[in-house]
């Protein structure tokens, strides 16, 4: 099941997705799409990076973090109820069934009516930003920060693959952070 994130109408929504490049500048193509991840690529692409830069984006969708360091989290500006739904972050690691795909559910709530004008907090600031993997080897576990609306049972252990070796090529299709290299 998808990890759920929430935002109010008019706020910016933040959908986290990360990977760790094997070396600085050694980027992996990433696509973001509206709708669950299909078998290949992303459907209804809203943003895409290649091995150098962001090469496609649509209005209101942008990367706020440093994508050159693997922070490919999506920010959706000034959300409306129509922005609710599943979003796909696909980290397109080359190799047979080597890519990683993450489905994130965005729930948009109507804006709260407040009696007095107050400074509205940006949605992005409400979310801790990192979900990292630690260790090395097939029994690697994840270290979680405080992530709102995440049920821990939804996050399974990620195998830190010896990618491109003749060893384990076992992909765990969950969580939203991977290490490459």
């Amino acid at each position: 099941s998808e990890v759920e994130y929430r935002a109010e109408v008019g706020q910016n929504a933040y959908l986290p997705c990360f990977y760790t490049p094997a070396a600085p500048g050694n980027l992996v193509p990433v696509c973001w799409g509206k709708g669950a991840c299909p078998v290949f690529e992303c459907g209804n692409v809203v943003l895409r990076t290649d091995e150098r830069d962001v090469n496609y984006w649509t209005s209101r969708y942008w990367l706020n973090g440093d994508f050159r360091k693997g922070d490919v989290s999506l920010t959706i500006e000034n959300v409306t109820l129509a922005d609710s739904g599943i979003y796909c972050c696909r980290i397109q690691i080359p190799g047979i069934m080597n890519d990683e795909k993450f489905n994130l559910k965005l729930v948009i709530k109507p804006a709260k009516v407040t009696p007095a004008p107050t400074r509205q907090r940006d949605f992005t600031a409400a979310f801790p930003r990192m979900l990292t993997t630690r260790g090395h080897g097939p029994a690697e576990t994840q270290t979680l920060g405080s992530l709102p609306d995440i049920n821990l049972t939804q996050i399974s252990t990620l195998a830190n693959e010896l990618r491109d070796s003749r060893l384990a090529n076992d992909l765990r299709d969950s969580g939203a952070t991977i290490r490459i290299g």
Epitope: F40, I96, D164, L167, A168, N169
Partner: antibody
Framework: EVQLVESGGGLVQPGGSLRLSCAAS????????MSWVRQVPGKGLEWISG????????DYVEPIEGRFTISRDNAKNTLYLQMNSLKSEDTAVYYC??????????WGQGTQVTVSS | DIVMTQSPSSVTASVGEKVTINCKSS????????????LNWYQQRPGQPPRLLIY???TQESGIPDRFSGSGSTTDFTLTISSVQPEDAAVYYC?????????FGSGTRLEIK
């Protein structure tokens, strides 16, 4: 020595079903993604499906998605392909292949599937 | 999808001759993260399953004779058989393993005179 032995092929009518099996030996089966590749007689090769080592991820090409199901039993070192709603264009030799991220490094001998009325 | 185009479709050679088979991908199959080309070569003898010869464009699979070598990068790749032997009569396929679907070339048939 790596060995992959497919079975379960045969003649089936359009709309029918078959279940292919691939018995693996000579390597740690659950460490590896496994794939099915098919070859229409006299034609080229087509990767059609793959399954990760723990079975947690499965991928299919569009022509078979929703009709074929790949699965594995790691306790039995066996890979499966359940083929439903078969069409004449599914007629081919079906190979299972041990899969590394960069290649299909070992292949079985193949099993013939013929879909005909 | 990445389309793989092989040439020639067939080639005839005498024992001891050098043979080159070409493969072109419709887009780059080089990984930015490890700088490797996700391009494979397979040999399929009559009545046999395919056998991996070369992966990463130029890395020879274990047990493959040294007369088989691969070269190239980005989108243009070559399989070279330095001195053809009778047992090399087969169809040779390239395949990209960069992104799904992992398409194969249409094959090059090698016949021995």
């Amino acid at each position: 020595e790596v060995q992959l032995v497919e079975s379960g092929g045969g003649l089936v009518q359009p709309g029918g079903s078959l279940r292919l099996s691939c018995a693996a030996s000579g390597f740690t089966f659950d460490d590896y993604t496994m794939s099915w590749v098919r070859q229409v007689p006299g034609k080229g090769l087509e990767w059609i499906s793959g399954i990760s080592g723990n079975g947690g991820r499965t991928d299919y090409v569009e022509p078979i998605e929703g009709r074929f199901t790949i699965s594995r039993d790691n306790a039995k070192n066996t890979l499966y392909l359940q083929m439903n709603s078969l069409k004449s264009e599914d007629t081919a030799v079906y190979y299972c292949a041990k899969t590394s991220p960069q290649s299909l490094d070992y292949w079985g001998q193949g099993t013939q599937v013929t879909v005909s009325s | 999808d990445i389309v793989m185009t092989q040439s020639p479709s067939s080639v005839t050679a005498s024992v001891g001759e050098k043979v080159t088979i070409n493969c072109k991908s419709s887009q780059s199959v080089v990984s930015g993260s490890n700088q490797k080309s996700y391009l494979n070569w397979y040999q399929q003898r009559p009545g046999q399953p395919p056998r991996l010869l070369i992966y990463y464009a130029s890395t020879q699979e274990s047990g493959i004779p040294d007369r088989f070598s691969g070269s190239g990068s980005t989108t243009d790749f070559t399989l070279t058989i330095s001195s053809v032997q009778p047992e090399d009569a087969a169809v040779y396929y390239c395949q990209q393993a960069y992104s799904a679907p992992y398409n194969f070339g249409s094959g090059t048939r090698l016949e021995i005179k």
